[in-house]
C-alpha cells in the first residue's frame, strides 16, 4: 500500500495473507468459513512452493493469539484466467479446515448485485504489499482509502487504453495506491467486498495508471458454484 497508514489492529477480520513457504505473497479475503478469495496470478508466483493462508493477523512476524496458518486443500483459479492478461483474475482457496471464527477472523459479505460502484465513492484497500517504490515491505497491515474512478476515464488512451472491461473497476492512484504484494486483497466499499486487487505488474502511485480491481459481483455465479 503506497501513501497509506497502519491499519487499526484486527479491525479487518476478513483480511488474509496468502503465503508461500512461510513468506507473504498476496493478499486475500475470507468470504466463507473455509474459503479465501484472492487473485489467480498469485499462484503463478508460487511455483511449486507450499501455499498456506494466514488469518487473524495484524503483524506478520509477532505472535498474536488470533493468528492461524491454514494449509490449502484446493486452489481454484477462475477457469478463464490466463497468465498474459488480467481478465478473470480470481482465485478461490479452500482451507484444510473451517477457520475458527472470532473477533479477528470473520468472513466479509461480498457484493452480489452486478452494478458499478458510484464513481467518487471512497473504498478501503488493505494489505501487506510494499509501502515504497524502493520495495520496503511492512510487517503490520496497511490500508488506504481510495476514490472509485469511472471506467471511461480509466479507459482513456493515456490511462489503461481500453483494457478495463465491465468486469473490472478502477480506483484513483495519485500517490495513494495498492501495489506489489497487495494483489488478491480486498477493495471494500460501505462494508461490502466490491473488488479484488488484480495482480498485474502495473506501476503504482501514478495517477495516469489507476488501480485495477476485479469486480466480485460480476463473478457471483462462479463464486457460488465453487463454494457450493
Amino acid at each position: 500500500i503506497l501513501g497509506g497508514r497502519e491499519a487499526e489492529a484486527h479491525a479487518r477480520p476478513y483480511m488474509a495473507s496468502v503465503q508461500v513457504n512461510g513468506e507473504h505473497l498476496c493478499g486475500g479475503v475470507l468470504v466463507a468459513e473455509q474459503w479465501v478469495l484472492s487473485a489467480a496470478h498469485c499462484l503463478e508466483d508460487a511455483a511449486d512452493g507450499k501455499v498456506q493462508v494466514l488469518l487473524g493477523a495484524h503483524s506478520l512476524s509477532q505472535p498474536e493469539p488470533s493468528k492461524r496458518l491454514y494449509d490449502v486443500l484446493r486452489a481454484v483459479p477462475h477457469p478463464d484466467s490466463r497468465p498474459d492478461t488480467i481478465d478473470h483474475d480470481l482465485l478461490l482457496l479452500q482451507l484444510s479446515e473451517k477457520a475458527t471464527l472470532g473477533p479477528a477472523v470473520r468472513p466479509l459479505p461480498w457484493q452480489r448485485v452486478d452494478r458499478d460502484v458510484e464513481p467518487g465513492t471512497l473504498c478501503d484497500v488493505a494489505g501487506w504489499g510494499i509501502v515504497s517504490h524502493a520495495g520496503r515491505r511492512p510487517d503490520r497491515l496497511q490500508h488506504v482509502l481510495l476514490p472509485v474512478l469511472d471506467r471511461a476515464t480509466c479507459n482513456r488512451r493515456t490511462h489503461h487504453d481500453g483494457a478495463i472491461t465491465q468486469r473490472m473497476m478502477c480506483a484513483e492512484s495519485n500517490r495513494r495506491d495498492s501495489c506489489k504484494g497487495d494483489s488478491g486483497g480486498p477493495l471494500v466499499c460501505g462494508g461490502v467486498l466490491e473488488g479484488v486487487v488484480t495482480s498485474g505488474s502495473r506501476v503504482c502511485g501514478n495517477r495516469k495508471k489507476p488501480g485495477i480491481y476485479t469486480r466480485v459481483a460480476s463473478y457471483a455465479a462462479w463464486i457460488d458454484s465453487v463454494l457450493a
Epitope: E8, R12, P103
Partner: antibody, heavy 117, light 107 residues
C-alpha cells in the same frame, strides 16, 4: 495510574434497557482494544463485548448478540455498553477492561445491574 | 466453543504454604492463558499472561506453567493478602473464556 470507572448500573425491569459507561484515564485510551465482562450472582465471569481501538470492529458472543451494543468515544475517553431487552439472566456486575498483550490487563471496579420486576 | 475447567473450586491452605490451581481446556489453546486475582468490591487483577509471564509488580511467589490443554498456577509462601478468588482466562483466537474460579482461604 490506569483508571477505569464504570457507571450507569441500577435496577431495571425485564424487557428494559440500560446504557453503561466507562470513563478511562491514565493511559492513551485510543490505543487499546476494550471489552465488557460481567460477573453473575454465581460468581462466574462472562465476556460480553469487544471493540477495537478505533471502533472499527466489534464482537459479541452468541449469548448477547443482537441485544448488547458496545461503542466508544475516543475524544471523551469513554467506553459504552447499550443493553436492551434485558432478562433476569443479565443480572450481574459489569466490568470494563482494557486489553494488553491481548489479555485483559486492567479492570474497573464494576457497576451492578439488577433485572427484576 | 472451548471450555475451561478449573479445579478445585475452593481450597484452604496455611500461611507460608503453597497452593496449586489447574485449568484444563477442551482443546489446545496455544499457551494463551492468563490468571487473575479477584477480591470483593474490586475488579480482577491480572497476575500472569501467556501461561507464565508475570505482570510488572507481581511478586515471584506467583507462577504459571503448562501447554496444550493443561495449565497450572501456583502461589508459594502464602500471605494473608492472597485471600481471594482466582480465575484462569483463555484468550486464544481472541475468544475469551474464564474458568469457574477457585476460592482461596487461609487455615
Amino acid at each position: 495510574e490506569v483508571k477505569l470507572v464504570e457507571s450507569g448500573g441500577g435496577l431495571v425491569q425485564p424487557g428494559g434497557s440500560l446504557k453503561l459507561s466507562c470513563a478511562a484515564s491514565g493511559f492513551t485510551f485510543s490505543n487499546y482494544i476494550m471489552s465488557w465482562v460481567r460477573q453473575t450472582p454465581e460468581k462466574r465471569l462472562e465476556w460480553v463485548a469487544y471493540i477495537t481501538n478505533g471502533g472499527g470492529a466489534t464482537y459479541y458472543p452468541d449469548t448477547v448478540k443482537g441485544q448488547f451494543t458496545i461503542s466508544r468515544d475516543n475524544a471523551k475517553n469513554t467506553l459504552y455498553l447499550q443493553m436492551s431487552s434485558l432478562k433476569s439472566e443479565d443480572t450481574a456486575i459489569y466490568y470494563c477492561a482494557r486489553h494488553d498483550f491481548y489479555a485483559l490487563d486492567f479492570w474497573g471496579q464494576g457497576t451492578s445491574v439488577t433485572v427484576s420486576s | 466453543d472451548i471450555q475451561m475447567t478449573q479445579s478445585p473450586s475452593s481450597l484452604s491452605a496455611s500461611l507460608g504454604g503453597k497452593v496449586t490451581i489447574t485449568c484444563k481446556a477442551s482443546q489446545d489453546i496455544n499457551k494463551y492463558i492468563a490468571w487473575y486475582q479477584h477480591k470483593p468490591g474490586k475488579g480482577p487483577r491480572l497476575l500472569i499472561h501467556y501461561t507464565s509471564t508475570l505482570q510488572p509488580g507481581i511478586p515471584s511467589r506467583f507462577s504459571g506453567s503448562g501447554s496444550g490443554r493443561d495449565y497450572s498456577f501456583s502461589i508459594s509462601n502464602l500471605e494473608p493478602e492472597d485471600i481471594a478468588t482466582y480465575y484462569c482466562l483463555k484468550y486464544d483466537n481472541l475468544l475469551y473464556t474464564f474458568g469457574g474460579g477457585t476460592k482461596l482461604e487461609i487455615k
